[in-house]
Interface confidence: low
Amino acid sequence: SGTTNTVAAYNLTWKSTNFKTILEWEPKPVNQVYTVQISTKSGDWKSKCFYTTDTECDLTDEIVKDVKQTYLARVFSYPAGNVESTGSAGEPLYENSPEFTPYLETNLGQPTIQSFEQVGTKVNVTVEDERTLVRRNNTFLSLRDVFGKDLIYTLYYWKSSSSGKKTAKTNTNEFLIDVDKGENYCFSVQAVIPSRTVNRKSTDSPVECMGQEKGEFREI
């Protein structure tokens, strides 16, 4: 139903990494425009991306207000140049998104190894604590601030001269591992939220290897 020259949006999909959250949909508009609304289950609808010809809408500012809430979005279709026109039921056509709970579902972004330092047979590897767009008291929280000890990192490390990998885990952003003296090692880390059932792991960080000078990064 609806006016003959508008079609309802479809394939509404949440794309979210480290809480940067964009709703995408189809189709590319032909003689129509879209407006998006977002709401928590118990809250009021808030309109975003008014009368846009895009097929995506950045909803980050809304979801970061409370990342543990469950959100629902809907995309309205209007005839281009006649946004007052409605469907046969007296309302514009719209389609609902799947529910989205940022804390549970946002993808973990690719982590970065910030530094490593060798002292004797120990190496301290530090993972960069990435900043998110979640705010508290006007400051942006880091991934660790938001997830606390729900977030762990897994370190994969191996001698540059071999392919046998070892692993270590931490619920902070630092690893202290034993290494063989005189050997160079390569490192990669992965962010993990073990308690999740979906989107549990990030992609692996870029590989960093120990060079001739202590703490030098060499990406391979």
């Epitope: 543990k68 729900d150 308690s195």
Partner: antibody, heavy 126, light 107 residues
């Protein structure tokens, strides 16, 4: 009807072991966290820990870590709280409760309780 | 651990009164606070979650408000069955913690 039914009262001696149970019915047992709460005589509520029966993910309060074991058997929709060696100070009422899947819930960090068992009184005395 | 402090520890009121119980968190907990009612020799009953959302089946005379560190439970018109002990609980961070309880007695 959604309910949690706990096993009956227990009287034990110090050093003995014990396993009490909490059986869920009327809902998908594997999809909700179950928690255990202690209430010592005349005192308030203390959160002991929780378990997600779907994958047996378990979290303990630091005060109870190593003192008790929380487990579940999803085939019979039952959660358990057990002690390997009881002490007189374990004398208390123990409640199981289901975590509400409302605002603030995520499987990463669960929320408030909604459904409570009737409680199991455990008395430890020589 | 986050400490939850309820006040008053006890209070006396009459049927029909409007009663307010407060709960203060030692650090900010957003809206992640629940309220429970417990009568003598009975299991607790869930009243409110997410600071202000009523659990299913709870009478509308119960309401909750607050965010951050300060929260209130209000009973707009006390009924005889409301005399009990009330507990707040934060679930913002691990470990979950309860307030010490507020005993509501008949005046």
């Amino acid at each position: 009807e959604v309910q949690l039914v706990q096993s009956g009262a227990e009287v034990k001696k110090p050093g003995e072991s014990l396993k009490i149970s909490c059986k869920g019915s009327g809902y998908s047992f594997t999809s909700y966290w179950i928690g255990w709460v202690r209430q010592m005589p005349g005192k308030g509520l203390e959160w002991m820990g929780i378990i997600y029966p779907g994958d047996s993910d378990t979290r303990y309060s630091p005060s109870f870590q190593g003192q008790v074991t929380i487990s579940a058997d999803k085939s019979i929709s039952t959660a358990y709280l057990q002690w390997s060696s009881l002490k007189a100070s374990d004398t208390a009422m123990y409640y199981c409760a289901r975590i509400h899947r409302g605002a603030g819930y995520s499987s990463s960090w669960p929320g408030a309780f909604d459904i409570w068992g009737q409680g199991t009184m455990v008395t430890v005395s020589s | 651990d986050i400490q939850m402090t309820q006040s008053p520890s006890s209070l006396s009121a009459s049927v029909g009164d409007r009663v307010t119980i407060t709960c203060r968190a030692s650090q900010g907990i957003s809206r992640w606070l629940a309220w429970y009612q417990q009568k003598p020799e009975k299991a607790p009953k869930s009243l409110i979650y997410a600071a202000s959302s009523l659990q299913s089946g709870v009478p509308s005379r119960f309401s909750g408000s607050g965010s951050g560190t300060d929260f209130t439970l209000t009973i707009s018109s006390l009924q005889p069955e409301d005399f009990a002990t009330y507990y707040c609980q934060q679930y913002d961070s691990d470990p979950i913690t309860f307030g010490q309880g507020t005993r509501l007695e008949i005046k």
